[in-house]
Interface confidence: medium
């Protein structure tokens, strides 16, 4: 059933054999195969791709490959009643209409079932009114409008540029400001890099290109109708009025050609400063309404999309572990795309496919990993991380007892400059050690390690000679595993140069122009960056599944806990008088962090010295490492966000994509000076310090000697 190799310290030649088997040419071939037609969640095309992947993973040699289906709430435009935005005159005549679709890229003119740009889960409606330009629609943008400029968005249609924060947060902010509709657009300042041509001649966004995307505020709930539980065949579903996270006002996305027509007529207040100006030849006036001659004209939205309960399919592949089959290392990425998915997600799915093929090759030669590896092709990620969340809800009892780690595998590239890693501190040392063993694909770093090029190009802001590793936020399928279940998680991809490229994401994100040719012509012609990402993701999975002692270093958690405690304390110290008045002290938190540091240090010493040939002691030590991430979970969750249960990290309340440290304390302190009841507000700060201090102390004690 197993070879001897599985029980020994990871033999270098096995890791080498696994890495050597990964081929750029295969990734290229798989990417091409996955991107020829759209694979929108809930469609027949995506079901067929699921079955194809199931069949191929079986051929590659996995022990079992199953489809896991769920019936979840999805959203689609009405095929006979298209969504659009108009400028109307005083008689109600439409004098300008936004485009109904993106001009298809060369070679794709005859492809059917390209979903037109829409904001998924927008309610239906035809609001009309004056326009207000709200910059990025961030919390601070609405503060500027409402508090400084005294501009009231109530009853207005707001227009916001994409970028900086998750679009769902923009819509939530607009709703809270009283807006009756939201128009989202891509400004060239954010989606057109200087000196680069627009697609098909380069990787920039053309004027007719539009970013699709969901506008939910799920806060980790998964399917809006079955929060906390799987959307299976006997599920009890909420009514649509009680559904989680749905927007209450119509929302629609447009490109910058159409945005120009709306913004060029804007009157009212001038932009407050240069940070509110994009790159269009318009004044970026805030409004409300149009200027002088056009003041009687209004904007009208026509939104007719429908929400429908639809079947989705995850593909779950298993490679059984030889020694610890009840310990799971998971590699997962999504399969559904908005259109062709050239980058998102298929650049990731192609890498997963090649990783599965390589593991399968080793298995056919008689090798097995020490621990079980699960491979997942998630569905409906674009509609709110639905496939991964429903599967995790269905399997939560197994996962919380057996889950060692989750490695995410969405887009492999968002640029071709250097590596980007976001992960739990437990994985820092694993990532450092692995990247030191891999070759850099970067020009000018021939013969150098990936670690070296990464550190040079993306240095840590705190630790000299080390690369930057960022916090996990959300907006991808690791969310349920990390934020809800407390399973150590990480993600890696190749990214752009953040110093010189200030645009948000990559310009063609979620547009029809995200094609195979975009990747093959402009981002990674040799697929060498894809191969490197495959080596990083695959190498992490290999080590996590095969090393005798789990490759987690708890001392790195101690370091960041101190950093995060310092940071949150410094934020609180903006209010020294209130700290004194309400007797707010961080002593308990700093004490808990100190205890964690000491206990982690002692645990690490014991880890070096224990008898690794004793399977009971080995399992005990590994379980302490595996369950450390779990120990940061508060079963009650964060205030008003029950599915975000990690006390150290949560998605920012102001930007789902970003991670926030000590989020309970951070949110309690946020804008505290504006709270109507300061005593209550500072009481909540104190409660959150107590929760954080207790959790850190409790986590520390899981690392103490067991008896």
């Amino acid at each position: 059933k197993s070879s001897n190799e599985a029980t020994n310290i990871t033999p270098k030649h096995n890791m080498k054999a696994f890495l050597d088997e990964l081929k750029a040419e295969n990734i290229k071939k798989f990417l091409y195969n996955f991107t020829q037609i759209p694979h929108l969640a809930g469609t027949e095309q995506n079901f067929q791709l699921a079955k194809q992947i199931q069949s191929q993973w079986k051929e590659f040699g996995l022990d079992s490959v199953e489809l896991a289906h769920y019936d979840v709430l999805l959203s689609y435009p009405n095929k006979t009643h298209p969504n659009y935005i108009s400028i109307i005159n005083e008689d109600g005549n439409e004098i300008f209409n936004t485009s109904l679709f993106e001009p298809p890229p060369p070679g794709y003119e005859n492809v059917s079932d390209i979903v037109p740009p829409f904001s998924a889960f927008s309610p239906q409606g035809m609001p009309e009114g004056d326009l207000v330009y709200v910059n990025y629609a961030r919390t601070e943008d609405f503060f500027k409008l409402e508090r400084d400029m005294k501009i009231n968005c109530s009853g207005k249609i707001v227009i916001a540029r994409y970028g900086k924060v998750f679009r769902g947060n923009k819509v939530k902010n607009a709703q809270l400001a009283g807006a009756k509709g939201v128009i989202l657009y891509s400004d060239p300042a954010d989606y057109f890099a200087p000196g680069v041509k627009s697609y098909p001649d380069g990787w920039n966004l053309p004027g007719g290109g539009v970013q699709r995307g969901n506008i939910l505020n799920l806060n980790g709930a998964g399917d809006p109708l079955t929060p906390g539980y799987p959307a299976n065949e006997y599920a009890y579903r909420r009514g649509i009025a009680e559904a989680v996270g749905l927007p209450s006002i119509p929302v629609h996305p447009i490109g910058y050609y159409d945005a120009q027509k709306l913004l060029e007529k804007m009157g009212g207040s001038a932009p407050p400063d240069s940070s509110w100006r994009g790159s269009l030849k318009v004044p970026y006036n805030v409004g409300p309404g149009f200027t002088g001659n056009f003041s009687t004209q209004k904007v009208k939205m026509h939104i007719h999309s429908t929400n429908e309960v639809t079947r989705i399919y995850n593909v779950i592949g298993t490679l059984r572990g030889a020694v610890e089959p009840d310990r799971y290392v998971i590699l997962g990425g999504h399969r559904d795309s908005w259109v062709f998915g050239g980058i998102d997600p298929q650049s990731g799915a192609a890498v997963v496919h090649e990783i599965v093929r390589s593991f399968g090759t080793l298995k056919k030669e008689g090798w097995r990993p020490r621990r079980t590896i699960l491979f997942a092709s998630w569905d409906a990620e674009e509609f709110g991380l639905l496939g991964s969340t429903e599967w995790a809800e269905e399997n939560s009892r197994l996962l919380q007892e057996r889950g060692v780690a989750y490695i995410n595998a969405d887009s492999s590239i968002e640029g071709n400059y250097t590596l980007r890693v976001d992960c739990t501190p437990l994985m820092y040392s694993l990532v450092h050690n692995l990247t030191k063993e891999l070759k850099s694909p970067d020009e000018g770093f021939e013969g150098k390690s990936l670690y070296e090029s990464w550190t040079k190009k993306s240095p840590s802001p705190e630790f000299s000679g080390m690369p930057r590793i960022s916090k996990l936020g959300s907006g991808n399928d690791f969310e349920v595993f990390f934020q809800r279940l407390g399973i150590a998680s990480g993600r890696a991809r190749y990214t752009k140069n953040w110093e010189t490229n200030k645009f948000s994401g990559y310009p063609l994100y979620h547009s029809v122009y995200e094609t195979y040719e975009l990747v093959e012509k402009f981002y990674d012609p040799m697929f060498k960056y894809h191969l490197t990402v495959a080596q990083v993701r695959g190498g992490m999975v290999f080590e996590l599944a095969n090393s005798i002692v789990l490759p987690f270093d708890c001392r790195d958690y101690a370091v960041v806990l101190r950093k995060y405690a310092d940071k949150i304390y410094s934020i609180s110290m903006k209010h020294p008088q209130e700290m004194k008045t309400y007797s707010v002290s961080f002593d308990s938190l700093f004490s808990a962090v100190k205890n964690f540091t000491e206990i982690a240090s002692k645990f690490s010493e014991r880890l070096q010295d224990f008898d690794k040939s004793n399977p009971i002691v080995l399992r005990m030590m590994n379980d302490q490492l595996m369950f450390l991430e779990r120990a940061f979970i508060d079963p009650l969750g964060l205030p008003d966000r029950p599915f975000y249960r990690h006390v150290i990290y949560a998605p920012s309340s102001h930007n789902k994509y970003a991670g926030e440290s000590f989020p309970g304390i951070y949110d309690a302190l946020f804008d505290i000076e504006s709270k109507v009841d300061p005593s209550k507000a500072w009481g909540e700060v104190k409660r959150q310090i107590y929760v954080a201090a207790f959790t850190v102390q409790a986590a520390a004690e899981t690392l103490s000697e067991v008896a």
Epitope: S274, P461, S470, K471, E499, M573, K574, G659
Partner: nanobody, 119 residues
Framework: QVQLQESGPGLVKPSQTLSLTCTVS??????????WSWIRQHPGKGLEWIGF???????HYNPSLKSRVIISVDTSKNQFSLKLSSVTAADTAVYYC???????????RGQGTLVTVSS
């Protein structure tokens, strides 16, 4: 858009104190989401982190430089400063000020200023 600009003498004598100021424009240094760093790059070498400061004075220094470094902030002028005492030729480098946070998009760096330590 936030911009950072370093200023200070380009030549410092050995054993003296190197003083640099970073002026932040287009955004407030008081934003609690960020910390403000000094970094240096020796000729032909990688970047070396010197230290960072929150606007309220909470500071972290690189342990290897801690005894010689003072970083301070002046929120009224939207500036933060670096003082490095007892300099030697080994402190010759391009000095950068930077804004940082925990997200990739937060990182911004000034143009840098070359400081030569020589008599």
């Amino acid at each position: 858009q936030v911009q950072l600009q370093e200023s200070g003498p380009g030549l410092v004598k050995p054993s003296q104190t190197l003083s640099l100021t970073c002026t932040v424009s287009g955004g407030s240094i008081s934003n609690s989401g960020y910390y403000w760093s000094w970094i240096r790059q020796h000729p032909g070498k990688g970047l070396e982190w010197i230290g960072f400061i929150y606007y309220n004075g909470s500071i972290h220094y690189n342990p290897s430089l801690k005894s010689r470094v003072i970083i301070s902030v002046d929120t009224s002028k939207n500036q933060f400063s670096l003082k490095l005492s007892s300099v030697t030729a080994a402190d010759t480098a391009v000095y950068y000020c930077a804004r940082d946070g925990d997200d990739y998009g937060d990182y911004l760096r000034g143009q840098g200023t070359l400081v030569t330590v020589s008599s």
